[in-house]
């Protein structure tokens, strides 16, 4: 599989936003790339979001996606929003070179995202 690098640990902001870079070593000159973020909790793997982009163009997730991102060369900057403490887990970056053939696939080792729910503000008298 292709080599895919991502940070081991990221701490989400108090607003529930986490960002990390997913970088892949492309064997050749792909023009169409698909990036998928997977969440692994226990032995279950679920898809968080996915986007296909043409090299040189912006990364576009679906309108209702909790992910946004930008791409630059073989690097994708991913941001996941709306995270809560229960969303803490391992987030895996999957990269597929879709076109031109051949097909290449790479899976990162995952980024452990820690999310801490903010303490509610105390009532003021």
């Amino acid at each position: 599989a292709m080599h895919v690098a991502q940070p081991a640990v990221v701490l989400a902001s108090s607003r529930g936003i986490a960002s990390f870079v997913c970088e892949y070593a492309s064997p050749g000159k792909a023009t169409e790339v698909r990036v998928t973020v997977l969440r692994q909790a226990d032995s279950q793997v679920t898809e968080v979001c996915a986007a296909t982009y043409m090299m040189g163009n912006e990364l576009t997730f679906l309108d209702d996606s909790i992910c946004t991102g930008t791409s630059s060369g073989n690097q994708v900057n991913l941001t996941i929003q709306g995270l809560r403490a229960m969303d803490t887990g391992l987030y895996i970056c999957k990269v597929e070179l879709m076109y031109p053939p051949p097909y290449y696939l790479g899976i990162g080792n995952g980024t452990q995202i820690y999310v801490i729910d903010p303490e509610p503000c105390p009532d003021s008298d």
């Epitope: 492309s26 064997p27 053939p101 097909y103 899976i107």
Partner: antibody
């Protein structure tokens, strides 16, 4: 048009050696990982070896059945990949295919190991 | 190495039938699965890549599905020219092994 043309197959005695070649055209050879796959008579497809390209430092990988006996190599200036086969056994008989990361395949070359 | 279990090993179906072939892997391969068709005397032909994507020039009768460890190749309406042996392959591993194959015949 993409073409992969294998050559070098033939009859060889057990314990002998043979070198297969695969000439590629119609695509950017240096951008691709190259593989050898075989099909023995009456058996299924068996992946044998892979050589990656320059961004991957020409890393090589082998199946357990051929490791230590077969060597894969490539010459990007000639758009060619090779399989050096040593210490051949009768069970190495089959049709050998080269493939550009399994998207493009050659027509195959027959290797027969027999005394 | 990741083990590939393909089933059935052979099947016979009628023209127009919907045909399903399955492939199970010993561990999660994250959709890194290809399907091939091999006809006697011909080179293998890539049908499906990345579990669900139809390769260029392949009939839309063929489709792939699955994730994790369980994958399926479906032929929506079997045609005489589909007689062949079909193989799955894991393309995630450094040792991209094939399934044992499914020989498909027409009744």
């Amino acid at each position: 048009e993409v073409q992969l043309v294998e050559s070098g197959g033939g009859l060889v005695q057990p314990g002998g050696s043979i070198r297969l070649s695969c000439a590629a055209s119609g695509f950017t050879f240096s951008d691709n990982w190259m593989n050898w796959v075989r099909q023995a008579p009456g058996k299924g497809l068996e992946w044998l070896a892979q050589i990656r390209n320059k961004p991957y430092n020409y890393e090589t990988y082998y199946s357990a059945s051929v490791k230590g006996r077969f060597t894969i190599s490539r010459d990007d200036s000639k758009n060619s990949v090779y399989l050096q086969m040593n210490s051949l056994k009768t069970e190495d008989t089959g049709v050998y295919y080269c493939t550009a990361q399994f998207a493009y395949w050659g027509q195959g070359t027959l290797v027969t190991v027999s005394s | 190495d990741i083990q590939m279990t393909q089933s059935p090993s052979s099947l016979s179906a009628s023209v127009g039938d919907r045909v399903t072939i399955t492939c199970r892997t010993s561990e999660n391969i994250y959709g890194g699965l290809n399907w091939y068709q091999r006809k006697p005397g011909k080179s293998p032909k890539l049908l499906i890549y990345g579990a669900t994507n139809l390769a260029s020039g392949v009939s839309s009768r063929f489709s792939g599905s699955g994730s994790g460890t369980d994958y399926t190749l479906t032929i929506s309406s079997l045609q005489p020219e589909d007689v062949a042996t079909y193989y799955c392959q894991n393309v995630l591993s450094r040792h991209p092994g094939f399934g044992s194959g499914t020989k498909l015949e027409i009744k």
